[in-house]
């Protein structure tokens, strides 16, 4: 029961996390900037991974996509890549984990297969969360390194004067969404990995068995040990048959009533 709960909770937490990573990636508020207060209107710039926007206090907003892939900073491309990889891994992880859920029966899928799938999805969620956290952190670092002094620098350019306005960009809402979402995906992944341990068979220790016929037509059930599936009464991997099947270490004894089927 605890395993099912852990697995289910891990799935839900990861689902919320991946939804958050997708939301953060699509958001425009990765960096925000309060430009200036004007007697007429206040103007705000905010930028995301895909486009740049200007908003006035009147509510008017205008957004435009970045020009080309080539003209963009390598760091922005890296952040985009990390976020997309995070989303793709997370989506695949969700798909795998749906089939791995203990509460869902698909054909005659064994618990060992479900355990492997749970572990796979857990690892995928962990990597997905790390990708998102890394992407957001790289962008945050870009903002910190661009947190210039607010002094204006004048120089002459083509067609007149160019004034570089070194305004301070601040962390946008998308960064916080990304960090939280990445963390949730990571936690969900860890929970899936923990659940995997509970799903996995406790002992799959099959000993080499030699069979010694001690009667005329005696049938033996093969396999002196049975791996636990987590269901039924044989949860401690006890020996099922005492006689007939003997390991090579054991002394041969006379057949008992348990040897016959």
């Amino acid at each position: 029961m605890a395993v099912t709960a852990c697995q289910g909770l891990g799935f839900v937490v990861s689902l919320i996390g991946i939804a958050g990573i997708i939301a953060a990636t699509c958001m425009d508020q990765w960096s925000t900037q309060d430009l200036y207060n004007n007697p007429v209107t206040a103007v705000f710039n905010y930028q995301g991974l895909w486009r740049s926007c200007v908003r006035e206090s009147s509510g008017f907003t205008e957004c435009r996509g970045y020009f080309t892939l080539l003209g963009l900073p390598a760091m922005l491309q890296a952040v985009r890549a990390l976020m997309i990889v995070g989303i793709v891994l997370g989506a695949i992880g969700l798909l795998v984990s749906i089939f791995a859920l203990k509460c869902i029966r698909i054909g005659s899928m064994e618990d060992s297969a479900k355990a492997n799938m749970t572990l796979t999805s857990g690892i995928m969620f962990i990597v997905s969360g790390l990708c998102a956290i890394a992407g957001v952190s790289v962008f945050a670092n870009m903002l910190v390194t661009n947190f210039w002094m607010s002094t204006a620098n004048m120089y002459t350019g083509m067609g007149g004067m160019v004034q570089t306005v070194q305004t301070r960009y601040t962390f946008g809402a998308a960064l916080f969404v990304g960090w939280v979402a990445g963390g949730l995906t990571l936690i969900g992944g860890v929970m899936m990995c923990i659940a995997c341990r509970g799903l996995a068979p406790e002992e799959t220790n099959y000993k080499a068995v030699s069979y010694h016929a001690s009667g005329h037509s005696v049938a033996y059930k093969p396999g002196g040990f049975k791996a636990s599936t987590g269901f039924g009464s044989n949860t401690k991997n006890k020996k099922i048959y005492d006689g007939g099947a003997r390991t090579e270490d054991e002394v041969q004894s006379y057949p008992s009533k348990h040897d016959y089927v």
């Epitope: 430009l35 710039n45 740049s52 200007v54 008017f60 970045y66 020009f67 900073p73």
Partner: nanobody, 120 residues
Amino acid sequence: QVQLVESGGGLVQAGGSLRLSCAASGRILNLNDMGWYRQTPGKQRELVASIFSSGTTNYADSAKGRFTISRDNAKKMIYLQMNSLKPEDTAVYYCNADVVTGLLQRNVYWGQGTQVTVSS
């Protein structure tokens, strides 16, 4: 790089009219605002009028009621219609644009200026 090119300046009689134009070109993501400033010898540049993306305008007291600023967002152009010109309006008129050119890149660009002379 963003270029601002002004045109429309010249010599005009007091009480006359002039229309200044400014065209912006180059890598412009967002035009926060564009405006006209003027400078007379020995004085600092002063704001005449500015216009935001939404069309919201801002005028200096000396320009109110006589000057009208307008904008064509598609062409990235601004215009300054100057009516009832006075000799004290004589100055070099500069076009100004506050522009976002890329990620974390915001610059204020100035044109080379156009001379407006109002004779009495």
